[in-house]
């Protein structure tokens, strides 16, 4: 039969003041039968932590079902940690004995001590809106956690980034520790619905990451493309031209018609869609009188996007004799 | 079966204080710990503290030290919470609880203890 | 404190639909690979009722129309098919850290 272990994995574990201890222990074999217990320390002066009686030690829950016939994890939990909890905890296992249980084999034991966990991580992205296909930066920053060893990595949309300095301050002893890191990211087109996500991992957090997160929507801006396109139908003396204004981000737009130079300030029809991605289409209507029109008609679409450079898209009309010459009996 | 015996309905009056009981049956009562919980509107459901019943240790929810303490009498298997210079905000639903073995939720629970604190 | 908030306050479903309760944390409430998150019905003038423990471990007694899921700070319990004898208040509860703490509650009718 196998010779039962007793593992504690953990040598050291660090809880901060308030918070609960999770404090692993598991068995390798059912046999012999008896309790395991949890003491504190070692030799005649050690202090019982755990007799599977809630009632003896309120603040003790274990992470498995002891009733359970095959349970080999008898790790608990310690709630409301104080000072008064640090020291060397030992699982024991007792043999089934008479008239009293007889020590059988202990865990080599694990130290607890008081740390400090890291505050929430802030990402902060660039002060200003990047076109897609450049590099922008973000910073993620933790403070406030001892002991020193910390993890942090930094996610795009779940995958893994590779390129990004981090620095934990001071480098020398102190009681708390800060981190600062800079991740590059490069934008995608598609990346108003994407997210970067900055995880701090530390030996206070028992497994479960801390996480920061930023909206690349905060960040980019995609360019808008333009199309002026003519509409084949007439209605009545005026032919309508469209102004397409499409895949850009963020939503603010000024769109202007001229007529040979000439801005417009007649009211013209629009409509504004959000694509899947997160970007926007704005569709513009124009409608051009053609009952008076020379022959040499340039219509410009001119839109400035998020405060940037004005970009237009010119349009020769066509307006045949034919069209000039009919009367106009089509219904508007 | 697992039984939490509480005392009845009390109408106080503000500034004095009120005993609420509660007896375990069916089980060893030192073996398990005895939760208090608060039940008023708005505040849902809070948790008070919880005692060991065999040591009579008894930890606090911050928001009730000086205002609840638990008490146990292990010869009548009856926990025991008082709360003093009582006010209307005192007014509530009460209860005890008890968990499962040494799980982490509250599997039984007394059938509560309504006081009403009234000038 | 973990503050658990609870969605909807209250709500209405079709006997032998599907409901569904919300409830969100404040902060996770996972510790190595456990989700420290219970649910309970209160019926009026009756004490709190364990339905669910450790996010999606079913009660003994409590019927498998119940059940629980999630994990860190996001939680759900589902009732499938609702029946008359449903209609309750419906709490969330963490056990990660101390102090233990309720949600505000959801309470479930039959439309």
């Known amino acids: 039969e196998e010779e039962l272990q007793m593992i504690q994995p953990e040598k050291l574990l660090l809880v901060t003041v308030g918070k609960t201890a999770t404090l692993h222990c598991t068995v390798t074999s059912l046999l012999p039968v008896g309790p395991v217990l949890w003491f504190r320390g070692v030799g005649p002066g050690r202090e019982l932590i755990y007799n599977q009686k809630e009632g003896h030690f309120p603040r003790v829950t274990t992470v498995s079902d002891l009733t359970k016939r095959n349970n080999m994890d008898f790790s608990i939990r310690i709630s409301s940690i104080t000072p008064a909890d640090v020291g060397t905890y030992y699982c024991v296992k007792f043999r089934k004995g008479s008239p009293e249980n007889v020590e059988f084999k202990s865990g080599p034991g694990t130290e607890m001590a008081l740390g400090a966990k890291p505050s929430a991580p802030v990402v902060l992205g660039p002060a200003a809106r990047t076109t897609p296909e450049h590099t922008v930066s973000f910073t993620c920053e933790s403070h406030g956690f001892s002991p020193r060893d910390i993890t942090l990595k930094w996610f795009k949309n779940g995958n893994e980034l590779s390129d990004f300095q981090t620095n934990v301050d001071p480098t020398g002893q102190s009681v708390a520790y800060s981190i600062r890191s800079t991740a590059r990211v490069v934008l995608d087109p598609w990346d108003v619905r994407s997210q970067v996500i900055c995880e701090v991992a530390h030996v206070t957090l028992q497994g479960d990451p801390l996480r920061g997160t930023a909206n690349l929507s905060e960040a980019i801006r995609v360019p808008p493309t333009l199309e002026v396109t003519q509409q084949p139908m007439r209605v009545g003396n005026q032919v309508n031209v469209t102004c397409q204004v499409r895949k850009f981000y963020p939503q603010s737009l000024q769109l202007t018609w001229s007529e040979n130079g000439n801005v417009c300030q007649r009211e013209t029809a629009s409509t504004l869609t959000e694509n899947k991605d997160g970007t926007y289409n704005w569709t513009s209507w124009f409608l051009v009188n053609i009952s008076d029109q020379r022959d040499d008609v340039v219509l410009t679409c001119q839109v400035k996007h998020d405060g940037q450079l004005a970009v237009s898209k010119r349009l020769a009309l066509e307006v045949t004799v034919h069209q000039k010459d009919q009367s106009s009996d089509a219904t508007p | 079966q697992v039984q939490l015996q509480q005392s009845g309905a009390e109408l106080v009056r503000p500034g004095v204080s009120v005993k609420v009981s509660c007896k375990g049956s069916g089980y060893t009562f030192t073996d398990y710990a005895m939760h208090w919980v608060k039940q008023s509107h708005p505040k849902s459901l809070e948790w008070i503290g919880v005692?060991?019943?065999?040591?009579?240790?008894?930890y606090y929810n911050q928001n009730f030290k000086g205002k609840a303490t638990m008490t146990v009498d292990k010869s009548s298997s009856t926990a025991y919470m008082e709360l003093a210079r009582l006010t209307s905000e005192d007014s509530a639903i009460y209860y005890c609880?008890?968990?499962?073995?040494?799980?982490?939720?509250?599997?039984?629970w007394g059938q509560g203890t309504l006081v009403t604190v009234s000038a | 404190n973990i503050v658990l908030t609870q969605s909807p306050a209250s709500l209405a479903v079709s006997l032998g639909q599907r409901a569904t309760i919300s409830c969100r944390a404040s902060e996770s409430v996972d510790s190595y690979g456990n989700s420290f998150m219970h649910w309970y019905q209160q019926k009026p003038g009756q004490p709190p009722k364990l339905l669910i423990y450790?996010?999606?471990n079913l009660e003994s007694g409590i019927p498998a129309r119940f059940s629980g899921s999630g994990s860190r700070t996001d939680f759900t319990l589902t009732i499938n098919p609702v029946e008359a004898d449903d209609v309750a208040t419906y709490y969330c509860?963490?056990?990660?850290?101390?102090?233990?703490?309720f949600g505000g509650g959801t309470k479930l009718e039959i439309k």
């Open positions: 509860q963490q056990s990660n850290e101390d102090p233990p703490t």
């Open positions: 609880a008890r968990r499962a073995g040494t799980s982490d939720w509250f599997a039984y």
């Open positions: 450790r996010a999606s």
């Open positions: 005692i060991g019943t065999y040591y009579g240790d008894a």
